[in-house]
Amino acid sequence: NKILVKQSPLLVVDSNEVSLSCRYSYNLLAKEFRASLYKGVNSDVEVCVGNGNFTYQPQFRSNAEFNCDGDFDNETVTFRLWNLHVNHTDIYFCKIEFMYPPPYLDNERSNGTIIHIKEKHLCHTQSSPKL
């Protein structure tokens, strides 16, 4: 019995900061959970993770390469990433695991969210020379 997750298919970022919401088909407040965000087609890199339950606000911690924080309500976990660079452009997957009380539950792999970090170009207005 797997939980479904909904993610936005694409987020285009030009401010070096993004919020990615993961909406689950399960009440987060029912059990103790571990919510995480993975980067890459094979979910190779765990970007951000938070443990939570109905009695305490989770502490989110990030991979050394990322800055992250998060928040949740009864059906959504939102990851906030900042100081993003062009090379962070990739596909990101939401994951949730419900540990206690048993039984263990996790989500079906979603289609992910492509986060596209736009390169910042310095624009110099070219003034035409006076004749």
Epitope: E32, E97, M99, Y100, P101, P102, P103, Y104, D106
Partner: antibody, heavy 120, light 111 residues
Framework: EVQLVESGGGLVQPGGSLRLSCAAS??????????VSWIRQAPGKGLEWIGE???????YYSPSLKSRVTISRDNSKNTLYLQLNSLRAEDTAVYYC????????????WGQGTLVTVSS | DIQLTQSPSSLSASVGDRVTITCRAS??????????LHWYQQKPGKAPKLLIY???SLQSGVPSRFSGSGSGTDFTLTISSLQPEDFATYYC?????????FGQGTKVEIK
């Protein structure tokens, strides 16, 4: 047949570290449906849960040991590891790995245990 | 943490006796009608062995003289007719919350 075999026990100096192994056979540590815990038992005492690892690689630890313990695994060897740092005399115990199912989290298979003695 | 208190801590009994061990949890270990409370038997120098899971389900291969009952916070392990191989220490364990905890054990000795 499911089997768990611990190794790596022995005499360790206070302040030192231990790394125990638990070789699993008859099931895969990375297949959904089962996880493995480490549990210890001091001489003549009861059972104490140390922590666990799920098929996903997620870990949970006992709050009393969290700052000193790491549970990891090598999927290619189907082996689980327990690293415990800053050892003290009270860490002297038989260390067991035990498998649990995802529905009830009951420990249905146990290793034979490995004895760790912390002494100078 | 959920505390589990077993009673008695030890008991002496004879072969053929009916033996009852109780386990009391500091809070309910029930969720959606399931009690996440399990019973194990341990003999000297050996690893524990699962007897009863989810309060009352008999583990495969365990003799039917072992039974479990209870819900919420109060649980019982019963051995209907004690056999020579049953002299051992018995532990209850909860898996409702992390950290998982065990009772302190009940040693069943020969009278």
């Amino acid at each position: 047949e499911v089997q768990l075999v611990e190794s790596g026990g022995g005499l360790v100096q206070p302040g030192g570290s231990l790394r125990l192994s638990c070789a699993a056979s008859g099931f895969s540590l990375s297949t959904s449906g089962v996880g493995v815990s480490w549990i210890r038992q001091a001489p003549g005492k009861g059972l104490e849960w140390i922590g666990e690892i799920y098929h996903s690689g997620s870990t949970y630890y006992s709050p009393s040991l969290k700052s000193r313990v790491t549970i990891s695994r090598d999927n290619s060897k189907n082996t689980l590891y327990l690293q415990l740092n800053s050892l003290r005399a009270e860490d002297t115990a038989v260390y067991y790995c035990a498998r649990y199912g995802y529905y009830y989290y009951d420990f249905d298979y146990w290793g034979q245990g490995t004895l760790v003695t912390v002494s100078s | 943490d959920i505390q589990l208190t077993q009673s008695p801590s030890s008991l002496s009994a004879s072969v053929g006796d009916r033996v009852t061990i109780t386990c009391r949890a500091s809070q309910s270990v029930d969720f959606h009608g399931i009690s996440f409370l399990h019973w194990y038997q341990q003999k000297p120098g050996k690893a524990p062995k699962l007897l009863i899971y989810a309060a009352s389900s008999l583990q495969s291969g365990v003799p039917s003289r072992f039974s479990g009952s209870g819900s919420g916070t109060d649980f019982t392990l019963t051995i209907s007719s004690l056999q020579p191989e049953d002299f051992a220490t018995y532990y209850c364990q909860q898996s409702y919350r992390s950290p998982r905890t065990f009772g302190q054990g009940t040693k069943v000795e020969i009278k």
